[in-house]
Interface confidence: low
């Protein structure tokens, strides 16, 4: 099966790489604009230069193109805890990230929030914190894992999943209570 091409891709495929077909005259192939620039005017004729202009501050193009406008620079979302790793330039968008000892949680493909890496108190680090994944903790005896924190088995209620992990401790507590009532 041949993938469906949009009109623009069809038109571009007629011209050699690095060129695009003139929108008003399909016998002319114009040279695409370099990254960091945008198309101001199409080339007037074969072998003549395309009029490309540099992107203004606050905008960019990251690859060769024939866009009529540069793309607006992304802004790091402070409300998501993001920090700017590198500023926007005419040929590269802003790069956003998280602070040290934080990881990214992606809400959607393009939106992430920064969270603090778990420290594994009362446990050990099974897998270190990664750029896009929290630390994976293993808890010490007498503690169970709840929402990636090691919680004392004294907080384990019988109805919870922790009963399997905390069974000896729970039985001991029960035994103590029983002996106190006799």
């Amino acid at each position: 099966l041949v993938p469906h091409l949009g009109d623009r891709e069809k038109r571009d495929s007629v011209c050699p790489q690095g060129k695009y077909i003139h929108p008003q005259n399909n016998s002319i192939c114009c040279t695409k604009c370099h990254k960091g620039t945008y198309l101001y005017n199409d080339c007037p004729g074969p072998g003549q230069d395309t009029d490309c202009r540099e992107c203004e501050s606050g905008s960019f193009t990251a690859s060769e193109n024939h866009l009529r406008h540069c793309l607006s620079c992304s802004k790091c979302r402070k409300e998501m805890g993001q920090v700017e790793i590198s500023s926007c330039t005419v040929d590269r968008d802003t790069v956003c990230g998280c602070r040290k000892n934080q990881y990214r949680h992606y809400w959607s493909e393009n939106l992430f929030q920064c969270f603090n890496c778990s420290l594994c108190l009362n446990g050990t680090v099974h897998l270190s914190c990664q750029e896009k994944q929290n630390t994976v903790c293993t808890c010490h005896a007498g503690f169970f894992l709840r929402e990636n924190e090691c919680v004392s088995c004294s907080n384990c209620k019988k109805s919870l999943e922790c009963t399997k992990l905390c069974l000896p401790q729970i039985e001991n507590v029960k035994g103590t209570e029983d002996s106190g009532t006799t």
Epitope: E79, H105, W107, Q113, F115, N134, E147, N148
Partner: nanobody
């Protein structure tokens, strides 16, 4: 037992304002991320806004950005949604929702508890 009780809904004219409240109980409120979700008549659920446990981080759906403000008072265990410049398309039942995890939500719909909802009708 976890309980979320919304209030503040009602009938308002286009361009008007309303403030929704959600009283929370049965869990350690300041620790959990919270959200507002809505359901317009005959439509599916639409996520509106979220706020982190510390109240510092917020996020809004594009449809309400600049008009709605989410906030919380952790000392009162209450979540708020200030709705300004209301439009007919904001007509919906608004639900307060608690995220299942306090570490990081798995998605925008990773809720374990919902309120019963409060109806907001925007009409002239």
């Amino acid at each position: 037992e976890v309980q979320l009780l919304e209030s503040g809904g009602g009938l308002v004219q286009p361009g008007g304002s309303l403030r929704l409240s959600c009283a929370a109980s049965g869990f350690t409120f300041p620790v959990y991320n919270m959200a507002w979700v809505r359901q317009a008549p005959g439509k599916g659920l639409e996520w509106v806004s979220f706020i982190a446990g510390n109240g510092q981080q917020t996020y809004y759906a594009d449809s309400v950005k600049g008009r709605f403000t989410i906030s919380r008072d952790n000392s009162k265990n209450t979540l708020y949604l200030q709705m300004n410049s209301l439009r007919a398309e904001d007509t919906a039942v608004y639900y307060c929702a608690k995220f299942a995890s306090k570490v990081s939500p798995m998605s925008l719909t990773d809720f374990d508890y919902w309120g019963q909802g409060t109806l907001v009708t925007v009409s002239s």
